[in-house]
């Protein structure tokens, strides 16, 4: 007799989730010698332990602590890149600028990037049919709590000048409800972080507005300043050119610095 299964509004666990986490862990520890000591089987066991057999609307940050402990990693000062609503460009940037790191360049972020997962109360099964949706079902679901947990930790450990890439094409360039706005901003440590530098990425080729004057950026500046962290903002008018210049800084068209405008 098939057992009754809770139907959630979100898509189910990503196909071959356990194998993907394990394979990603092996690959990551291969190319990051500082994480070579990590036992990927233990990482998977800790990941699994955070959500298996638990009601998927009652997951806590505490559930992920064993995993967080295993994945402890530090980023050098001035090398943290946060992002909001512009993941692809942020990742393209760190693929070129290899000494800067987004959360998804760290082990735990890399393991979970673009994946969905959840279990069921009192069974050892993974639910491949459906998982809770943040809006329609609950916010304390395995995926949302994971990202909140690791984002908090990522922000807490940042130091020096922290950079954030923001999407200038959105109606809210800075969104207080995003992970950046609700978690990371509030967990930067003023005693370790001297400044937050926002890079506002323009969408249109002919867009020459100073988006650093946007009301939501002013709101971000206010929040950051109140936390005794200095704030800077730059317009990135041509993201394609910006990436090209990161790849080839010696290019004559890059030396003039025309691809962004600086605002304090």
């Amino acid at each position: 007799v098939p057992r009754w299964r809770q139907q959630w509004s979100g898509s189910g666990t990503t196909s071959r989730f356990p194998e993907t986490v394990l394979a990603r862990c092996v690959k990551y520890t291969e190319v990051h010698p500082e994480m070579r000591h990590v036992d990927c089987q233990s990482v998977w066991d800790a990941f699994k332990g955070a959500f298996i057999s638990k009601y998927p609307c009652n997951i806590t940050e505490e559930d992920y602590q064993p995993l967080v402990k295993l994945g402890t990693q530090t980023v050098p000062c001035n090398k943290t890149l946060l992002w909001s609503r512009i993941k692809d460009l942020a990742h393209q940037f760190t693929q070129v600028q290899r000494d800067m790191f987004t959360l998804e360049d760290m082990l735990l972020g890399y393991l979970a990037d673009d994946l969905t997962w959840c279990g069921e109360f009192n069974t050892f099964e993974i639910n491949y049919q459906s998982c809770p949706d943040w809006r329609k079902d609950c916010s304390n679901n395995p995926v949302s709590v994971f990202w909140k947990t690791v984002s908090r930790r990522f922000a807490e450990t940042a130091c020096g000048v922290v950079h954030v890439m923001l999407n200038g094409s959105r109606s809210k360039i800075f969104d207080k409800n995003s992970t950046f706005g609700s978690v990371e901003v509030h967990n930067l440590q003023p005693e370790k972080v001297q400044a937050l530098e926002a890079w506002v990425i323009h969408g249109g080729r002919e867009d020459s507005r100073d988006l650093c004057q946007d009301p939501t950026i002013k709101e971000l500046e206010s929040i950051i300043s109140k936390r005794n962290i200095r704030f800077f903002c730059k317009n990135i008018y041509r993201p394609d050119k910006f990436l090209q210049c990161v790849k080839n800084p010696e290019d004559s068209s890059c030396l003039s610095g025309i691809h962004h405008h600086h605002h304090h």
């Epitope: 071959r16 993907t20 394990l22 394979a23 862990c25 092996v26 690959k27 291969e30 070579r36």
Partner: antibody
């Protein structure tokens, strides 16, 4: 018992490409790390790159970047190594090998029998 | 990348004698070192991993030692089937690198 069986010897012209296959039998192919290592006549071993079939997204040694393409087909449990713009110095035996399944250290416990690629005009 | 240097290039030993092969890393590789044996026309065969652990089916006459930058493979009493080329490989820092090999030949 896991085995890696490679395709046969190839003779190629300079400037052309070669594609060597490596078929795995036994075990869970998707989670192996399949690696390619080459050995020029009378020379030592040289690591070229590796792939985890489930993920795709191979890693390459700097020396071969841009010239080598490593792929894997999970449906046939076969990994491939394609080397382009061949020159005489690429004449070598090409081996596929794997790490201990699936999350052991990065030494090679199982090897294919090797494929001799001769580049000659 | 880490450079692995093996010495000597060739070692001439009589059957029954002891052979000592050396492998030096250009920087510390901890104990993340493997040894392989290769006979003519064959693929390499794993002998030792973790600097000192024998792989499955490898006779007790093969032993490995060392850590950091200096490693040794010892064959306590050479048998006729042991005459071959031996390679060390570090798997501490990506990309993985091999030594250039030591040929053990009959004296």
């Amino acid at each position: 018992q896991v085995q890696l069986v490679q395709s046969g010897a190839e003779v190629k012209k300079p400037g052309s490409s070669v594609k060597v296959s490596c078929k795995a039998s036994g075990g869970v192919f998707s989670l192996y790390t399949i690696t390619w290592v080459r050995q020029a006549p009378g020379q030592g071993l040289e690591w070229m790159g590796s792939i985890i079939p489930l993920l795709g997204d191979p890693e390459y040694a700097q020396k071969f970047q841009g010239r080598v393409t490593i792929t894997a087909d999970e449906s046939t449990s076969t990994a491939y190594m394609e080397l382009s713009s061949l020159r005489s110095e690429d004449t070598a035996v090409y081996y596929c090998a794997r790490y201990p399944y699936p999350y052991g250290s990065k030494y090679f416990d199982i090897w294919g029998q090797g494929t001799l690629v001769t580049v000659s005009s | 990348e880490i450079v692995m240097t093996q010495s000597p290039a060739t070692l001439s030993v009589s059957p029954g004698e002891r052979a000592t092969l050396s492998c030096r890393a250009s920087q510390s590789v901890s104990s993340n070192l493997a040894w392989y044996q290769q006979k003519p026309g064959q693929a390499p065969r794993l002998l030792i991993y973790g600097a000192s652990t024998r792989a499955t089916g490898i006779p007790a006459r093969f032993s490995g030692s060392g850590s950091g930058t200096e490693f040794t493979l010892t064959i306590s009493s050479l048998q006729s089937e042991d005459f071959a080329v031996y390679y060390c490989q570090q798997y501490n820092n990506w990309p993985w690198t091999f030594g250039q090999g030591t040929k053990v030949e009959i004296k």
